[in-house]
Every structure is written in C-alpha cells, then in structure tokens.
C-alpha cells in the first residue's frame, strides 16, 4: 500500500493529462483527486501510464468506490480493466452493451481471461437472458463463447438470439450443448423456406432428433457428409436406407469413405444388407438377408 504523503506544492492535478506520466507513484497517490479521476477516466487511456502508475489509479478508484464502480467509470476504464480482479468485477452492475463492448475491446485478440468471463457473467445475469445483441457482440469477440456455456446457461438463450450465431461459433460445441441449441434454432428459423432453412439450421443439426432428420429428407437438402458425420448417432440409427439416400442426395456416395466411422458404421450395422446393396456403394456389415430383426425396445416395453 502506498504511504499517505502530502502533495508537493504546485503539483496538485487540476485535470488528467500527460504531465501525470512524470509523477512518481506516491505523487499520483497524493496529488490526484479520486473524484477528478472518476470524472475524467476517458482521458486515462490516451496517456501512456506504466503498470505501476495504473495500480495507483486503480487503488484511488477502489477507495472512492468500495462497493464497486459506477457504470460511468467502468465504461471508460480502458486498459485499467486489465488490472481488475474477478472479485472487483463481481461488485459491478454493468447494463450497457456499449460498456461491455468497450471492455471487450481492451482484451481483444487474447484468450478469454477470468476477468472477461466474470464481466460477461455479470452482464448476462443483469440482463436476465442472452439476447441477440449481446450474443452478437460476444461471438464477434469470442467465436467459441457459446460453446463455453453449460447446457443450463444455454437454456436462457432466447430463440431470437440464434440469428446472431455463425457456423464457426458452434465449432467446439459438444452434443449436450447442441441438444439445447437445436430446438431454439428450429423455432427461430421455422418460417424460412426449405433451402434457406437448411442453410441456417445446418450448423445446429448435431442436436437434431431422428424425426427432424427424416423431415429434412423431404426437403431436397443434399446434406454433405461433413454435416452427416456430426449428427447424433442415436438420431441416425433409425433412418432407413431410402431416407439417408434422400437426405444426402448426390452426396450418398460419400458413405463408402466413412463406412468405418461413426455414425455411418453403427447405422450400417442396423440396416438389412439387401437394402444397403441397393445403394450400389459396396457397403458391408448389414443384417444378413433372411435374418429376423427383433425390436428390442418393443420387447422391453411389453415385459
């Protein structure tokens, strides 16, 4: 902690300007009024203060606002934000998207720090839900943001926000996250026509149930193999050969190259070999002709 020392004569700061970079730490502590600093925070960013000097300025604000900074100060923190701890940020009440953007800008190009994560958490909790504008902003700064959220957190995303999501934002999402996001996406895009709908929903299909995949097969979507390989295995297994053929369209030939990988491998095992043979792709491993297929789920339901 910096000692309390009197400000030397003539050094009392009347405004926040570049002359302050020549002040020693103790002089900043003694000669800069915290209230002045708070009202002129927007100037701090333009002045090349050292990290040590920024520590002093932060200390002054902490003393002035022990319960947490007001948003008028937070919005102009600039590089001083990097000095904040998650504990500091938890005291804040950030409601303006402009404030959020300003602080994310400071951290741009870096991994999401604990400070940023805390800031986002405070902001989203304050808003009550992850609305479209917020999601737009967050995914612009952190494309993987959405996939960093738990399924529980994702459940607060309203369907309208899904319009802000780009395919790359979902690259690192796991099936549990897509299970939550897919129904929201289906709702968000439900009024679009077939081909436009597919373009939008495609990235979310890792959360699609069997029925929706069967329905997609009715829309001439010609799903590519990369998308097919990301589908839930349990959703793919009940699809018939004809449905997969219709779903993939001309891309059905790509099944051969993927026949040893899930979900194609597991799907092949569920099909009658003579049905697979009709594709003319040489897919092997289906149920031999003449074998009886028992529906175990039905058997369990009856017993």
């Amino acid at each position: 902690e910096v000692e309390k020392t009197a400000c030397p004569s003539g050094k009392k700061a009347r405004e926040i300007d570049e002359s302050l970079i020549f002040y020693k730490k103790w002089e900043l502590e003694a000669c800069v009024d915290a209230a002045l600093l708070a009202t002129q925070m927007d100037r701090v960013n333009a002045i090349p203060f050292t990290y040590e000097q920024l520590d002093v300025l932060k200390h002054k604000l902490d003393e002035l606002y022990p319960q947490g900074y007001p948003e008028s100060v937070i919005q102009h923190l600039g590089y001083l934000f990097l000095k904040m701890s998650p504990e500091d940020i938890r005291k804040w009440n950030v409601t303006s998207l402009e404030t959020l953007k300003a602080l994310l800008e400071v951290n741009k190009g870096h991994e999401m720090s604990p400070q940023v994560a805390t800031l986002i958490d405070r902001f989203v909790k304050g808003r009550g839900q992850l609305d479209k504008d917020t999601l737009d902003t967050l995914t612009a700064f952190y494309p993987g943001y959405l996939c960093s959220l738990s399924p529980e957190e994702l459940s607060s995303v309203p369907p309208s926000s899904i319009w802000a999501v780009r395919p790359q934002d979902l690259d690192t999402c796991d099936p549990r996250q897509l299970d939550v996001l897919y129904p929201k996406a289906r709702l968000a895009f439900q009024n679009m026509n077939g081909s436009e709908y597919f373009v939008k929903i495609q990235s979310f299909l890792g959360g699609a149930p069997t029925e929706d995949l069967k329905a997609l097969s009715q829309q001439n979507v010609s799903m590519d193999l990369a998308t097919f390989m990301k589908l839930r295995t349990d959703a793919v297994l009940p699809l018939t050969v004809a449905e997969v053929q219709k779903l993939l369209g001309p891309h059905v030939e790509g099944l051969k190259a993927e026949e040893r990988h899930r979900p194609v491998r597991d799907w092949i095992l569920r099909q009658r070999q003579d049905d697979l043979d009709t594709l003319g792709l040489g897919l092997q491993g289906g149920i031999p002709n003449g074998y009886l297929v028992l529906d175990l789920s039905m058997q369990e339901a009856l017993s």
Epitope: A215, N220, A242, G249, T278
Partner: antibody, heavy 117, light 107 residues
Framework: EVQLVESGGGLVQPGGSLRLSCAAS????????MSWVRQAPGKGLEWVAT????????YYPDSVKGRFTISRDNSKNTLYLQMNSLRAEDTAVYYC??????????WGQGTLVTVSS | DIQMTQSPSSLSASVGDRVTITCRAS??????LNWYQQKPGKAPKLLIY???RLHSGVPSRFSGSGSGTDFTLTISSLQPEDFATYYC?????????FGQGTKVEIK
Amino acid sequence: EVQLVESGGGLVQPGGSLRLSCAASGFTFSDYFMSWVRQAPGKGLEWVATISNGGTYTYYPDSVKGRFTISRDNSKNTLYLQMNSLRAEDTAVYYCARFDGYIFDYWGQGTLVTVSS
Amino acid sequence: DIQMTQSPSSLSASVGDRVTITCRASQDISNYLNWYQQKPGKAPKLLIYYTSRLHSGVPSRFSGSGSGTDFTLTISSLQPEDFATYYCQQGNTLPYTFGQGTKVEIK
C-alpha cells in the same frame, strides 16, 4: 409381414365430415412416416397427406390443405385422416400407405368414401 | 407441381411379349422415380424404386431405367399375372405426384 387395414369410409353429404383410420402391424409403426393416397373411380392415384413418424410434421397437396388433417397415435399403431368440408370430387378409395423416404412401399386395401347428396 | 406423363395410356400385348412403358417428368427428378402395379379392385404394389431397384419379391423380368426426366419400365417377357395398370411416381419434390397410369391388356 407389413399389414395396413383402413376403415371409416362410407357415404357422406357434401360439406360433411368423415374420419378414416388405418391399423398398422408387422413393423415398428413409430419409426415410419405414413401417408394417405386416394383414387377416384376409374382414375389415377393422388397423394393426399403425409405425417412424420412422431407426428410433428404434416404435408398436404393444395387440393386438401385446410380441409383434411392427418394424425397418428403411435401407442395404438393407428393412422387417421380427418376429412372436413367434403366435396363431390373427394369421392375416392382412400389408401393408407407406409412412406419410406420417397417411396410408398406398402399399401392397405383401401376404404371407399362417397360424397353425394 | 411436377407433372408426370405416361405413355401409352393403354397397350395390348400377348404373353411372352416384351413390353415398354415410358414416364416423363415435367422437370428433373434425379432418379427418384418409382413404379407401381395395380390390379382391378386391389391396392397398388411397389415394383421398382429409385428408377431401377426391384422391391423385394418382384420378379426379375421387371426392370427400370432412365434419369432426369425420362424413364422406362420394361417387362422382358409378359406373364399372365402382369396384366394390370402401371403407375409411375416421382419422389423428388413435394407434392409427390403420379402418372395417369398405363393399362396393359391381353391382346
């Protein structure tokens, strides 16, 4: 062996309603889309409606849209067609058919619906 | 909607004859073309799907060919049980549509 048995056909006045049923057996009903296809006397085949395996999605041609409603009860392995505002041109044999991707692969024996005053 | 046009509307043939029925789609339907056989007072039965693939239990004298808009059903050697009406159906695009039928009669 796949079996589809339609019922509920009969004589109805123009503007009237009728509900057809189709009892399915020999396959896992809840795994398949199902359809209704009709055939007017001495005429060709016309697709009437299709429903997804879970009942979420339904499809109709313009000729019956808004008048006919396809539904299903997977617990009873039964398909339905509710026909309202019936017209003389709806007179036909109505077939229930299993729908696989793009193929009507198994058909029932049909039930005759006659719309006449 | 895609229109399906079959020709001829009817034909007379003898047992053992080679019979060819054509079906034309008003726009490209890839290979999503199916053929059905219907006998009087009976339900239609699937014969061929995806242009050329025989449904289970269908005799090998039936064959199909074509692509895009023009398709053919061929019966290599007509048998007594083959006298019936044949329908083509496109499964490419909703609404799914059928041809008007071709009646194969005994000469």
